[in-house]
């Protein structure tokens, strides 16, 4: 039975506003999957825990993804 092809991305809109690292609680990286064809970056802000979707094409996020994959390759068994 083929898997459902319904697109279920978490991010409805993407913020192109730069994020100040001091105001970040955490960043979650959700890789592309059969449910959502694009990588999603969800920033949780320190104030009120507000969540914001960041543009994976921005220079900062590309740098971040590069750093994460570098870490991943270092730590993978």
């Amino acid at each position: 039975v083929p898997l459902s092809r319904t697109v279920r991305c978490t991010c409805i809109s993407i913020s192109n506003q730069p994020v100040n690292p001091r105001s970040l609680e955490k960043l979650e990286i959700i890789p592309a999957s059969q449910f959502c064809p694009r990588v999603e970056i969800i920033a949780t802000m320190k104030k009120k825990g507000e969540k914001r979707c960041l543009n994976p094409e921005s220079k900062a996020i590309k740098n971040l993804l590069k750093a994460v994959s570098k870490e991943r390759s270092k730590r993978s068994p």
Partner: antibody
Framework: QVQLVQSGAEVKKPGSSVTVSCKAS????????ITWLRQAPGQGLEWMGE????????NYAQKFQGRVTISADESTSTAYMELSGLTSEDTAMYYC???????????????????????????WGQGTTVTVSS | QSVLTQPPSASGTPGQRVTISCSGS????????VNWYQRLPGAAPQLLIY???QRPSGIPDRFSGSKSGTSGSLVISGLQSEDEADYYC???????????FGGGTKLTVL
């Protein structure tokens, strides 16, 4: 082990500008923040501002706003601090230091998390003396 | 005038225990962590304590830190002559949106 090496001593005239550089080695430059501080003779430590190269965003101390510019060049792993409108009160030892560090958790799961931990300035440059004199 | 308040000087004899206080407000120490730095003569500062009470590797356990409300404390037990230095407390200030320091405490080992 991360090391920070700063540029050499500077002697400047009042009203001019100075640029101090801070070159990082032994770590991923973009995955931490660089802070700039100074210590004037007989005074305490003073925070001037910081930059996170990965995000390209700088925060400045209110006191220096409009007079200081902090930048970073990822290709050379170097941070810069430019201070303009110098007066004799800017005569001080200037330091760069590593502050916030990116930590990745749940790395081998399908949803890695990144946090930035500001655990204090744990690596310092050797300091650059800036003397402002006519 | 420093945002955080420290005594300008402290002293003790070898083997003694010395406490250095650091007083702030709700916008800095009250809502953020305290760090302590040691500055030996002619050297760059060194991180002694982070996150109120954590020691970086290589820092002897004679140094300890604590935080209560809007104040922090650094305790040096078993004082040694090489501990003679300037000590600075620091925190982040949410109102000023920047790192703030105490004026420093000059520790003399008698």
């Amino acid at each position: 082990q991360v090391q920070l090496v700063q540029s050499g001593a500077e002697v400047k005239k009042p009203g001019s500008s100075v640029t101090v550089s801070c070159k990082a080695s032994g770590g991923t430059f973009s995955s931490f923040s660089i802070t700039w501080l100074r210590q004037a003779p007989g005074q305490g430590l003073e925070w001037m501002g910081e930059i996170t190269p990965m995000f390209g965003i700088a925060n400045y101390a209110q006191k220096f706003q409009g007079r200081v510019t902090i930048s970073a060049d990822e290709s050379t792993s170097t941070a810069y601090m430019e201070l303009s409108g110098l007066t004799s009160e800017d005569t001080a030892m200037y330091y760069c230091a590593r502050d916030g560090r990116f930590d990745v958790s749940d790395l081998l799961t399908d949803k890695p998390k990144v946090t930035i931990n500001y655990n204090g300035m744990d690596v310092w440059g050797q300091g650059t003396t800036v003397t402002v004199s006519s | 005038q420093s945002v955080l308040t420290q005594p300008p000087s402290a002293s003790g004899t070898p083997g003694q225990r010395v406490t250095i206080s650091c007083s702030g407000s709700s916008s800095n120490i009250g809502s953020n962590t305290v760090n302590w730095y040691q500055r030996l003569p002619g050297a760059a500062p060194q991180l002694l304590i982070y996150n109120n009470d954590q020691r970086p590797s290589g820092i002897p356990d004679r140094f300890s830190g604590s935080k209560s409300g809007t104040s922090g404390s650094l305790v040096i037990s078993g004082l040694q002559s090489e501990d003679e230095a300037d000590y600075y407390c620091a925190s982040w200030d949410d109102s000023l949106n920047g790192r703030v320091f105490g004026g420093g405490t000059k520790l003399t080992v008698l």
